[in-house]
């Protein structure tokens, strides 16, 4: 007697009736009614049996508008997932003020989540359909492979970056000096070599270590995930202790906020210039703007009081430009790279990740270039016969000249993914022979030779006012790092949400499924297992959307925005205007 | 071609017993868990009993420690002891392979394939 399929209901919409159908209260039912000893009572099903056979139905007993309905969303759910991390693929490509160590992690995880898009929710939605597997046993172990590596290597890449966060924020003076793209990429690789190992070889030769296949035709599963304690193990270390990690490593970054908010209210709340000083030189660990970390931890006291005034520190690679950077002006990717001054330190949030070949700290004073009157250079001998008035604007800074050679440096500003709109000034440090009397050693001729000559009292009174004006900004630009970090707070609290959101349903069911064999119907199932692959269609979301570059190089890319000019014109408009004017009618301060 | 052939129904007295066999063809039966449904006229189909890959067995309350499921790998049958029969278990029998570990041991639909069916028919 020839046998006939019954999976005629969908496998996603239980409620829809064709032959072989449940009742809708079939799929809902509770777990908590499952007896002593196993038995089960159960609710009765709807009876109106037919004798096709839709094993071999390529719409697997499901109606044509079900069929359309399941493809068209999750069509759209892959095309987005493909289009989105695609995007980001291509912007870190094509934009190389996107090329910090951040973002590689942001580029792996992205292969990883659009492995998925393009291979996994494919391949699972025809399953679904058909619902059963037609490729045959290679393709089922091979996708399943695909499928567990991908998703593995995504959950890894998230763990990766809640670690590079969590120690970018927490340890900045030892972590950050080791934080290069060649670690990065052994991170990287190790969340792929972990992936592959843990499933790749598990997957694909189990059947032959075990001597038989058990996956029965049509059906395509992991073999050696037929036991349900070994599904659960599998779980634990792919979900359970990754979302545990995770959470702690958040938490603690947000209580460091917290604490630093704190630390703040506390600046704030005082003026003093003792208490200016240990703000711009704080003993606990932060991160690397807002601490203004030294390269050396050891330097002298009186180096300390003499830059304790107002500086900041800036991550760079050199101030010099090389023949490469002469050379962006010509080339066809100039306009990705918004190298000057303003806008190298603009770049957007992805700031925090900057890896340096030969990553230094210093600090570097801006040259003021005024009219009539010779560059100043780490001077505090300041020309007296004009004065200089500061605008509204932020003070002690100067935005550099226009066509001054570019410039690459990046600020070790907070945390990346957040869109916080980044500063566009570049500070001034003041050398402050005020109250001292006297400088310390520095490698600058032009200090050695004017830094010790007497200050006029206007010039004394100009000094104190931009030491008083400046500590000010400081902790406006401690308060404006905070706010990023919040905002980075924010995104990795997004991100983790996200994470739990879509992975939790999918891991309960096996986590269910170990104490209660059978019990979860196949479309509960199918439902977790998808929830699971929009983790990898938020993913772009979460962090590149979170990201002011990533942004701004998805709408060039999106509205095919190829003209130099507009672009240049975009980046121009971003720059702000110079703070320091001279002012020609004479005025006593 | 896989083919699920159920046998041993027929007419009882209510308290009387008996043993349906389902004897599968096409498919390896110790890759598949088995289930057991009915069918009364004129009312909706039950889950009766099912097994699992892993040995464990669920019966529906009713039939609880009346009925039980049971199989024979090696002769590629499942079968399902009814003792203590009642006049309610008349109905038209089914067995069903479930192929997914992924799936319910009463959900119908979750079940790869059936058999067509054999009557019991309990008189009082």
């Known amino acids: 007697m020839t046998l006939h399929s019954n999976s005629t209901t969908s496998p996603l919409f239980p409620n829809i009736s064709s032959s072989w159908v449940h009742s809708p209260s079939e799929a809902g039912l509770p777990l908590g009614t499952v007896t002593q000893l196993g038995s089960y009572n159960i609710s009765q099903e709807t009876g109106n049996f037919s004798s096709n056979d839709t094993s071999s139905d390529p719409l697997g007993g499901h109606t044509i508008w079900q069929v359309v309905f399941i493809a068209f969303l999750t069509g759209f759910l892959a095309l987005v997932t493909i289009i989105g991390n695609i995007l980001v693929i291509v912007a870190f490509k094509v934009n190389k003020q996107l090329k910090t160590v951040n973002n590689y992690f942001l580029l792996s995880l992205a292969c990883a989540d659009l492995i998925i898009g393009v291979i996994s929710m494919n391949l699972f939605t025809t399953y679904i359909i058909m619902n059963r597997w037609a490729l045959g046993n290679l393709a089922c172990d091979l996708w399943l492979s695909i499928d567990y590596v991908a998703s593995n290597a995504s959950v890894m890449n998230l763990l990766v970056i809640s670690f590079d966060r969590y120690f970018s924020i927490t340890r900045p003076l030892t972590y950050r000096a080791k934080r290069t793209t060649k670690r990065a990429g052994v991170m990287i690789g190790l969340a792929w070599v972990i992936s592959f190992v843990l499933w790749a070889p598990a997957i694909l030769f189990w059947q032959y270590f075990v001597g038989k296949r058990t996956v029965p035709p049509g059906e395509c599963f992991i073999q050696f995930l037929s036991e349900p304690t070994i599904t659960f193990g599998t779980a634990i270390a792919a979900f359970y202790m990754p979302v545990t990690i995770m959470t702690i490593l958040y938490w603690r970054i947000y209580k460091e906020t917290e604490k630093r908010t704190k630390e703040l209210a506390g600046l704030q709340a005082s003026g003093t210039e003792a208490e200016a000083e240990n703000f711009v030189h704080p003993t606990g660990s932060s991160r690397s703007c807002s601490s203004y970390e030294l390269q050396q931890q050891g330097v002298k006291r009186s180096s300390r009081r003499k830059y304790g005034r107002c500086h900041f520190w800036f991550t760079t690679k050199s101030w010099k430009p090389s023949a490469e950077q002469m050379d962006q002006d010509h080339s066809s990717s100039d306009s990705w790279n918004n190298n000057d001054a303003a806008a190298s330190l603009e770049n957007s949030a992805s700031s925090d990740e900057e890896d340096i070949g030969s990553e230094t700290r210093a600090i570097y004073s801006i040259v003021l270039k005024l009219p009539g009157h010779s560059s100043i250079l780490n001077s505090t001998k300041l020309p007296s016969s004009d004065n200089l008035q500061v605008s509204n604007e932020d003070l002690g800074t100067v935005d550099v000249e226009r066509n001054a050679h570019k410039l690459q440096a990046q600020k070790s500003m907070g945390d990346g993914d957040n869109c916080q709109k980044d500063f566009t000034k570049l500070p001034i440090q003041l050398e402050s022979a005020v109250d001292t009397g006297k400088t310390s050693d520095t490698n600058s001729s032009a200090d050695k030779t004017t830094a010790t000559l007497p200050l006029s009292f206007k010039e004394a009174t100009l000094a104190k006012r931009f030491a008083l004006k400046t500590r000010s900004q400081i902790t406006k630009r401690k308060r404006m790092s905070l706010i990023k970090e919040k905002k980075a707070a924010q995104t990795l609290s997004a991100i983790l949400l996200a994470f739990i959101i879509t992975w939790t349903p999918y891991n309960i069911m096996v986590l269910v499924n170990t104490f209660c064999d059978s019990c979860i119907p196949k479309t509960y199932w199918n439902l977790g297992y998808w929830l699971c692959y929009i983790n990898s269609t938020v993913n772009p979301v979460c962090y590149a959307l979170c990201n002011k570059t990533f942004r701004t190089t998805f709408k060039t890319l999106l509205l095919c925005q190829c003209d130099k000019r507009k672009r240049r014109k975009q980046q121009y408009q971003q720059r702000q205007s110079v703070i320091f004017h001279k002012r020609v009618p004479e005025q006593a301060l | 071609q896989v083919q699920l052939q159920e046998s041993g129904g027929g007419l009882v007295q209510a308290g009387g017993s008996l043993r349906l066999s389902c004897t599968a063809s096409?498919?390896?039966?110790?890759?598949?868990?088995m289930g057991w449904f009915r069918q009364a006229p004129g009312k909706e189909r039950e889950f009766v009993a099912a097994?699992?890959?892993?040995?464990?067995?669920y019966h529906q309350d009713s039939v609880k420690g009346r009925f039980t499921i049971s199989r024979d790998n090696a002769k590629n049958t499942v079968y399902l002891q009814m003792n203590y029969l009642k006049p309610e278990d008349t109905a038209v029998y089914y067995c069903?392979?479930?192929?997914?570990?992924?799936?319910?041991?009463?959900?119908?639909?979750?079940?790869?394939?059936r058999g067509q069916g054999t009557q019991v028919t309990v008189s009082s």
């Open positions: 069903a392979a479930r192929g997914s570990r992924r799936s319910a041991y009463y959900s119908s639909s979750d079940y790869t394939y």
């Open positions: 096409g498919l390896t039966l110790s890759n598949y868990a």
């Open positions: 097994d699992t890959w892993n040995g464990n067995t």
